[in-house]
């Protein structure tokens, strides 16, 4: 079975690597433009140069191409707490990230928000904070984990999942109340 190729892939596959088929003349293979440049004019004939121009400020191409326009540089999303790690250049898009002691939470494939790493107060760090994952905490006795924070068992209500973790404390409280009534 032959895999289905898109029109552009079909056209490109006829030419050797690093070249593309002339859109008006499929007997001509033109050299692709280097990263940091874009296609201004196709090569006029076999063995002749493709007219490639450098990307203007605020745009880039990160690989060899035959694009008619450079791609616009990404902007870091300040409302998501993002900071610029490295600026856009003609051959590389802007790199956005988070500040120190923060991690990324992805709302979608390409969109992340920065959040502060949990400090595990009243607990210990089980797994350190990573680029895309918050710290994993283990709580001290008398505390339970709620939204990745160690909360006192005195805040544990019977309906919450904490009852198993806080059971000894709850039993102790109940026991002291009972002993006071005798």
């Amino acid at each position: 079975l032959v895999p289905h190729l898109g029109d552009r892939e079909k056209r490109d596959s006829v030419c050797p690597q690093g070249k593309y088929i002339h859109p008006q003349n499929n007997s001509i293979c033109c050299t692709k433009c280097h990263k940091g440049t874009y296609l201004y004019n196709d090569c006029p004939g076999p063995g002749q140069d493709t007219d490639c121009r450098e990307c203007e400020s605020g745009s880039f191409t990160a690989s060899e191409n035959h694009l008619r326009h450079c791609l616009s540089c990404s902007k870091c999303r300040k409302e998501m707490g993002q900071v610029e790690i490295s600026s856009c250049t003609v051959d590389r898009d802007t790199v956005c990230g988070c500040r120190k002691n923060q991690y990324r939470h992805y709302w979608s494939e390409n969109l992340f928000q920065c959040f502060n790493c949990s400090l595990c107060l009243n607990g210990t760090v089980h797994l350190s904070c990573q680029e895309k994952q918050n710290t994993v905490c283990t709580c001290h006795a008398g505390f339970f984990l709620r939204e990745n924070e160690c909360v006192s068992c005195s805040n544990c209500k019977k309906s919450l999942e904490c009852t198993k973790l806080c059971l000894p404390q709850i039993e102790n409280v109940k026991g002291t109340e009972d002993s006071g009534t005798t």
């Epitope: 939470h105 992805y106 709302w107 979608s108 494939e109 390409n110 969109l111 928000q113 959040f115 918050n134 939204e147 990745n148």
Partner: nanobody, 120 residues
Framework: EVQLLESGGGLVQPGGSLRLSCAAS????????MYWVRQAPGKGLEWVSA????????YYADSVKGRFTISRDNSKNTLYLQMNSLRAEDTAVYYC?????????????WGQGTLVTVSS
Amino acid sequence: EVQLLESGGGLVQPGGSLRLSCAASGFTFAKYNMYWVRQAPGKGLEWVSAISPKGQQTYYADSVKGRFTISRDNSKNTLYLQMNSLRAEDTAVYYCAEGMGSDAITFDYWGQGTLVTVSS
């Protein structure tokens, strides 16, 4: 079959409050980011708020920050949006959505929406 059913919309005076609910079924609700998106009359979609699977991370658009609160109850497969200090510009159809799109307004599944009208 994935279903998202919004409720709680209605007519409210400026400064008033409403609580929207979204009942989810047909997928593992507790595993997904959930979103509230709105569309004002004659305008495009606006991403209002989002909440992570366990509710630890939340996002709010600048236009609603400090007034709206997103929450979820995974035991009830329900998403909420508490809307306080409502303004005329909050008038819109509010949709809950689920999924991981390639950008902020691309979702796998949508509800049918609930209309919120803020007017005196």
